[in-house]
């Protein structure tokens, strides 16, 4: 079945942009001017998920790349990674759970909770140029709020 998708960039609440850091990692840093062209463009897709009142299930792929953010256990800890997929089969309505994030949208701020690991969120550090990761706390030192901008 076809899925609704859009292209966007994400910035954290400190206005740090997300860029590639090696082939399978994202990092967050402040960008200005022409450097903004480095930021990753996501293909966000509306997928099937658990019933909920305020959470919308999405998958986050990298535009024009066969890479999706996914959540897996590594050394017994929920971990965010970029995973290669077969572009002929993705995106799809019924994405595997590790690819699904529950988008929580309040006052133009977005949070992305892992469907696989409830209460774990896509997060960035306060520090510059640190990896984007899966964090188990909201409202602490680490940043879990993002803003989204459409990209044409």
């Amino acid at each position: 079945a076809p899925v609704r998708s859009l292209h966007c960039t994400l910035r954290d609440a400190q206005l740090k942009s997300l860029v590639m850091s090696g082939p399978y990692e994202l990092k967050a840093l402040h960008l200005q001017g022409q450097d903004l062209e480095q930021q990753v463009v996501f293909s966000m897709s509306f997928v099937q998920g658990e019933e909920s009142n305020d959470k919308i299930p999405v998958a986050l792929g990298l535009k024009a790349k066969n890479l999706y953010l996914s959540c897996v256990l590594k050394d017994d800890k929920p971990t965010l990674q970029l995973e290669s997929v077969d572009p002929k089969n993705y995106p799809k309505k019924k994405m595997e759970k590790r690819f699904v994030f529950n988008k929580i949208e309040i006052n133009n701020k977005l949070e992305f909770e892992s469907a696989q690991f409830p209460n774990w969120y896509i997060s960035t550090s306060q520090a510059e140029s640190m990896p984007v990761f899966l964090g188990g706390t909201r409202g602490g030192q680490d940043i879990t709020d993002f803003t989204m901008q459409f990209v044409s």
Epitope: L6, E105, S152
Partner: antibody
Framework: EVQLVESGGGLVQPGGSLRLSCTAS????????MAWVRQAPGKGLEWVGI???????YYASWAKGRFTISRDTSKNTVYLQMNSLRAEDTAVYYC?????????????WGQGTLVTVSS | IVMTQSPSTLSASVGDRVIITCQAS??????LSWYQQKPGKAPKLLIY???TLASGVPSRFSGSGSGAEFTLTISSLQPDDFATYYC??????????FGQGTKLTVLG
Amino acid sequence: EVQLVESGGGLVQPGGSLRLSCTASGFSLSSAAMAWVRQAPGKGLEWVGIIYDSASTYYASWAKGRFTISRDTSKNTVYLQMNSLRAEDTAVYYCARERAIFSGDFVLWGQGTLVTVSS
Amino acid sequence: IVMTQSPSTLSASVGDRVIITCQASQSIDNWLSWYQQKPGKAPKLLIYRASTLASGVPSRFSGSGSGAEFTLTISSLQPDDFATYYCQNTGGGVSIAFGQGTKLTVLG
């Protein structure tokens, strides 16, 4: 004040074209999904389509090919281009903002603009 | 996905409890919204995700259901509630569909 204002409606002959505009104030269209919904006189609501970024538009099956939704973020305006109009396209056309991205429901509506297709 | 509301018209009195039903042609989980529309006005979102009350909507309105069967209940009709009500499938792939509407009128 957060609001939507539609314009561009009017009388058009069958086979003609019309472009409707929907201008947003109080918020930016750079991160808001916008839909068009129409209502024929005395009839129910009918979804036309929705736009996210300029390359991501989705339409009701009956609207594909004849209707095109676009946006100009610099003018904070969304458009509905309607071609090959027929009498059955006569309706009030509303633009509406999606409550949250992919929520599919609409929390902010314009006042509507009437399109009449008649010779 | 086709959305079918019943009844098409409903007459009731102030203070009555009113129930409007909406049936989807296939399961839509809880991806259903309800709107109220008054003549010459734009629709107003009442309920989303089948049971969540939209901001500013009085608590006499409630929604329930999941899968393919949904209901909108007005616990005690007020004069301001006489209007047309629409259900809407909000999560059906790339397409969004409204029910045909239920017109709520004053009895007598």
